[in-house]
């Protein structure tokens, strides 16, 4: 099983973000970018009637959230 990445930036990441709700803070360039429209689930595999258990992170999925933190799937990435 693939290991998901741990939270990386630590102290480098401001908390909370300086962004408005429709934006996300892109840590590569350190500014807010539009991301609200991208917050939709990954398409299900063809023929699947219900989502498969997420036993391992797949590319384009969000990392596992920490306690009290919402991590949202992103089908596409900025």
């Amino acid at each position: 099983m693939r290991r998901g990445p741990r939270s990386l930036r630590g102290r480098d990441a401001p908390a909370p973000t300086p962004c408005v709700p429709a934006e996300c803070f892109d840590l590569l360039v350190r500014h807010c970018v539009a991301c609200g429209l991208l917050r939709t689930p990954r398409p299900k595999p063809a023929g699947a009637s219900s989502p498969a258990p997420r036993t391992a992170l797949q590319p384009q999925e969000s990392v596992g959230a920490g306690a009290g933190e919402a991590a949202l799937p992103l089908p596409g990435l900025l």
Epitope: L8, L28, V63
Partner: antibody, heavy 126, light 107 residues
Framework: EVQLVQSGGGVVQPGRSLRLSCAAS????????MHWVRQAPGKGLEWVAV????????YYGDSVKGRFTISRDNSKNTLYLQMNSLRDEDTAVYYC???????????????????WGQGTTVTVSS | EIVLTQSPSSLSASVGDRVTITCRAS??????LNWYQQKPGKAPKLLIY???SLQSGVPSRFSGSGSGTDFTLTISSLQPEDFATYYC?????????FGGGTKVEIK
């Protein structure tokens, strides 16, 4: 199948222009940032440029800044690299690649380049 | 610009050997370090991202470790298809930068 197919390379004289294309398929192109990376003959990899999913942000390596322009047409699922004022040192294999990130809460974390085109050769020579 | 220094620049090894490649960053990059494999005439392939996360489809003999400035790519038991050039790359800040590469050759 997730795929990036490149075209547009060739031989060009110094000072002239060339446009590279990268056609995407198998994924929602309009939702992904995209990069160009190059590799001179016998050398390592050099990052060239990146463009956001919606073209709202573009960044360039110092060696191409002011000469190269990255762009995209999401209606055609295609990424471009317009190369002007070409120099001998621009001779390389050029790769397009997809930006790989994760969203944690409201933070976007960058994890490199996860899908690459096959590469196209640009030779600048008189 | 963050400079990545890979070592060794080349190494000779046999099938079954344990191989270790190191990458040192000129400043702390947390765990924003990725590893790629490239074979002659082919595009690079992402192996490891976020220093230690195995990319989907990559064999488990590949592993990564490290944080801050010092990172390691390990191939636990070298296979014939692993002879290639390996690059580290930082995604901590623009401009993205790559290490100079490590060529793994057959002894």
């Amino acid at each position: 199948e997730v795929q990036l197919v490149q075209s547009g390379g060739g031989v060009v004289q110094p000072g002239r222009s060339l446009r590279l294309s990268c056609a995407a398929s198998g994924f929602t192109f309009s939702s992904y940032g995209m990069h160009w990376v190059r590799q001179a003959p016998g050398k390592g990899l050099e990052w060239v440029a990146v463009i956001w999913y919606d073209a709202s942000n573009k960044y360039y390596g110092d060696s191409v800044k002011g000469r190269f322009t990255i762009s995209r047409d999401n209606s055609k699922n295609t990424l471009y690299l317009q190369m002007n004022s070409l120099r001998d040192e621009d001779t390389a294999v050029y790769y397009c690649a997809r930006r790989f990130t994760h969203l944690r809460g409201q933070y976007i974390e960058d994890y490199g380049l996860d899908v690459w085109g096959q590469g196209t050769t640009v030779t600048v020579s008189s | 610009e963050i400079v990545l220094t890979q070592s060794p620049s080349s190494l000779s090894a046999s099938v079954g050997d344990r191989v270790t490649i190191t990458c040192r960053a000129s400043q702390s990059i947390s765990s924003y370090l990725n590893w790629y494999q490239q074979k002659p005439g082919k595009a690079p392939k992402l192996l490891i991202y976020a220093a230690s996360s195995l990319q989907s489809g990559v064999p488990s003999r590949f592993s990564g470790s490290g944080s801050g400035t010092d990172f390691t790519l390990t191939i636990s038991s070298l296979q014939p298809e692993d002879f290639a050039t390996y690059y580290c790359q930082q995604s901590y800040s623009i401009p993205l930068t790559f290490g100079g590469g490590t060529k793994v050759e057959i002894k």
